[in-house]
């Protein structure tokens, strides 16, 4: 296993939709052509994760049906969006890339995204 | 260095606009956010909102919403705060700093603003 | 939101003595708390990063502890250059908060 960079924002705000997008971007040291990407979230030092996806390089990400997370890939960038986030998501999102094939196996972690989210504010009740 | 330089002081009447700058500098500017606090003479902070300068998206304190607006150019490393409908109560120095993970690591040098009629 | 308080609100203490503030959140933020000192006529400055993380070029005579609710801000062996206003902030939800501060001077 080598260790390779990874790069992300350290902060960023998502938008009052709960929906917050960051680029992940990854110091390949070599031709890669299968790239696997988790995101990690980091809260009160716990890790759990967020989505994972598998792509071949020059196609999209395809994340899981039921997956919170979407992504599209631009050489070593990766645009990941989260979506469905509440204010108890607020957190460390972590970015893991994996250069699967050909070898050897490269692996980079990111320091974190500060993601900070706050839960809209209510609709006043209309009057019918 | 990581640097966050303020503009100049402002004297303004009741009911004015005032909007005061923060040029960043020794970072990437759009790795972090820019929160804007306030200190009224001989009192403690008051964190105003913040802005994340990745994509522009803001989150005001209730007291503020409506009145205060923060914007930034990225091509300048520049974040703004632009306060509405002053009030003599609004006489304060402003402060921006620098949103990490880690809270406000990196503060401005203040900008005192003095409304008077 | 979360409403942080500090006691005490001022500290006379003698140079060399131990200091000890307290800051106490209305709801649970685990660690994410960060105390600055705020000298008079400056900018504050970070001091403490969750809870207890020390910050690169801070005397090592400042520490803190604590979490959830509860958190402590320790100055062991206070210097003079040490009068200031001590707050604690919170990042762990918006909006973010700063408590009342606590002002210590030397006697």
């Known amino acids: 296993c080598k260790a390779m960079h990874v790069a992300q924002p350290a902060v960023v705000l998502a938008s009052s939709r709960g929906i917050a997008s960051f680029v992940c971007e990854y110091a390949s040291p070599g031709k890669a052509t299968e790239v696997r990407v988790t995101v990690l979230r980091q809260a009160d030092s716990q890790v759990t994760e967020v989505c994972a996806a598998t792509y071949m390089m020059g196609n999209e990400l395809t994340f899981l049906d039921d997956s919170i997370c979407t992504g599209t890939s631009s050489g070593n960038q990766v645009n990941l969006t989260i979506q469905g986030l509440r204010a108890m998501d607020t957190g460390l999102y972590i970015c893991k890339v994996e250069l699967m094939y050909p070898p050897p196996y490269y692996l980079g972690i990111g320091n974190g995204t500060q993601i900070y989210v706050i839960d809209p504010e209510p609709c006043p009740d209309s009057d019918f | 260095q990581v640097q966050l330089v303020q503009s100049g002081a402002e004297v303004k009447k009741p009911g004015a606009s005032v909007k005061v700058s923060c040029k960043a500098s020794?970072?990437?500017?759009?790795?972090?956010?820019i929160s804007w606090v306030r200190q009224a003479p001989g009192q403690g902070l008051e964190c105003m909102g913040w802005?994340?300068?990745?994509?522009?998206?803001?989150n005001y304190a209730q007291k503020f919403q409506g009145r205060v607006t923060m914007t930034t150019d990225t091509s300048t490393s520049t974040a703004y705060m632009e306060l509405r409908s002053l009030r003599s109560d609004d006489t304060a120095v402003y402060y921006c700093?620098?949103?990490?993970?880690?809270?406000?690591?990196?503060w401005g040098q203040g900008t005192l603003v003095a409304v008077s009629s | 939101e979360i409403v942080l308080t500090q006691s005490p609100d001022f500290q006379s203490v003698t140079p060399k003595e131990k200091v000890t503030i307290t800051c106490r959140a209305s709801?649970?933020?685990?660690?994410?708390l960060h105390w600055y000192q705020q000298k008079p006529d400056q900018s504050p400055k970070l001091l403490i990063k969750y809870a207890s993380q020390s910050i690169s070029g801070v005397p090592s005579r400042f520490s803190g502890s604590g979490s959830g609710t509860d958190f402590t801000l320790t100055i062991n062996s206070l210097e003079a250059e040490d009068a200031a206003a001590y707050y604690c902030h919170q990042s762990s939800s918006l909006p973010f908060t700063f408590g009342p501060g606590t002002k210590v001077d030397i006697k």
């Open positions: 802005i994340s300068a990745y994509n522009g998206n803001t």
């Open positions: 020794g970072y990437t500017f759009t790795n972090y956010g």
């Open positions: 700093a620098r949103v990490a993970a880690a809270g406000f690591d990196y």
């Open positions: 709801q649970s933020i685990g660690s994410s």
